[in-house]
Interface confidence: medium
């Protein structure tokens, strides 16, 4: 019987609406035993991996991805995926990061994230392409 890996979750601290130049931290959570968390960006070739995984609770692990100074180019959709040997998980809901011009604290609470997706091992055509997990040898173009 194969283990059903729970979908990861994604959130942003301090929120999803960030003033230009401020910091934001994406938090990816999954079950205990995760080896690698990946934060994916709104481009199939843009992602960042970390093995710096901490235990958030007895049943949950997490990884944090910090952007120290948010730029307009950081706006967009993000989601998480994780590797718990020997499998990659499904992908988390979407989280949309909005970057605003004016300074000051975020004017929006964490929004409810949305969709989910699974990694494509062998993409079928470019219009529907999702990149393969890192174990497939695809080069990461880092997010920041």
């Amino acid at each position: 019987q194969e283990e059903d890996l729970p979908r990861p979750s994604i959130s942003a601290e301090p929120g999803t609406v960030i003033p230009l130049g401020s910091h934001v931290t994406f938090v990816c959570r999954g079950p205990v035993g995760v080896q690698t968390f990946r934060l994916e960006r709104d481009s199939r070739s843009t992602y960042n991996d970390t093995e710096d995984v901490s235990q958030a609770s007895p049943s949950e692990s997490e990884a944090r991805f910090r952007i120290d100074s948010v730029r307009e180019g950081n706006a967009g959709l993000y989601r998480c995926i994780y590797y718990k040997p020997p499998k990659w998980s499904e992908q988390s809901d979407y989280l949309e990061l909005l970057v605003k011009e004016s300074s000051g604290g975020p004017d929006s609470p964490d929004t409810e994230p949305g969709s989910s997706a699974g990694p494509t091992q062998r993409p079928s055509d470019n219009s529907h392409n999702e990149h393969a997990p890192a174990s497939q040898g695809l080069k990461a173009e880092h997010l920041y």
Partner: antibody
């Protein structure tokens, strides 16, 4: 392509299993396969989806209430087991492939549908 | 709970004219919206995804637009073959399959 089978005339409170056979693509490509139904003269209603990758996540509409079960086999087949059927379950049942990427989640391949009629 | 409201429920169009169908989401769906065409007695067909990207083989007479919570499907140079019901579908909360589709818009050609 995808093709459904198993539609039939069933009495209320009866059970039925629908089968969806996929061809031309592999489940190892980690899609979702979904069932969507359409009652006569009505709109589209999503029932359930299953992830075809190495984990088998299943997702159901809240109204299903455990009456329907979606499952897959390694040989590119997805089934929908339906129990405690009522007249309101009369519909054409479509099998579809769902792509999920940064273009969103959308149904790019549909079967022709199979008709399920619940009547005494 | 994310809900899609599609308007109008039905519309009549003249050959060569233009049809506009609206789809409103109860929260922002980040352009992750698809449109489908379903002709009577047939399976649905994907027309547009990510709000404005035409699916393979779809005529450029179909145009999707919008952002945030408001989206529009425009059919220009309407042809008799366009008689169908059109559905929007949000692809933002993809594994919460409740209320994924709009209620549909029937397009009749006069």
């Amino acid at each position: 392509s995808v093709k459904e089978s198993g539609g039939d005339l069933v009495k209320p409170e009866g059970s039925l299993t629908l089968t969806c056979k996929a061809s031309g693509f592999s489940f190892s490509n980690s899609y979702y396969m979904c069932w969507v139904r359409q009652a006569p003269g009505k709109g589209l209603e999503w029932i359930a989806c299953i992830y075809t990758g190495s984990t088998s996540g299943t997702y159901y509409a809240s109204w299903v209430n455990g009456r329907f079960t979606i499952s897959k086999t390694p040989s590119t087949t997805v089934t929908l087991q339906m129990t405690s059927l009522t007249v309101a379950d009369t519909a054409t049942y479509f099998c579809s492939r769902k792509l999920t990427n940064f273009n969103g989640a959308y149904l790019d391949l549909w079967g022709p549908g199979t008709l399920v009629t619940i009547s005494s | 709970e994310l809900v899609l409201t599609q308007t109008p429920a039905s519309v009549e169009a003249a050959v060569g004219g233009t049809v506009t169908i609206n789809c409103q989401a109860s929260q922002s769906i980040s352009n992750l919206l698809a449109w489908y065409q379903q002709k009577p007695g047939q399976r649905p067909k994907l027309l547009i995804y990510r709000a404005s990207t035409l699916a393979s083989g779809v005529s450029s007479r179909f145009k999707g637009s919008g952002s945030g919570t408001e989206y529009t499907l425009t059919i220009s140079g309407v042809q008799c073959d366009d008689a169908a019901t059109y559905y929007c579908q949000q692809g933002y909360t993809s594994n919460n399959v409740d209320n994924a589709f709009g209620g549909g818009t029937e397009v009749e050609i006069k």
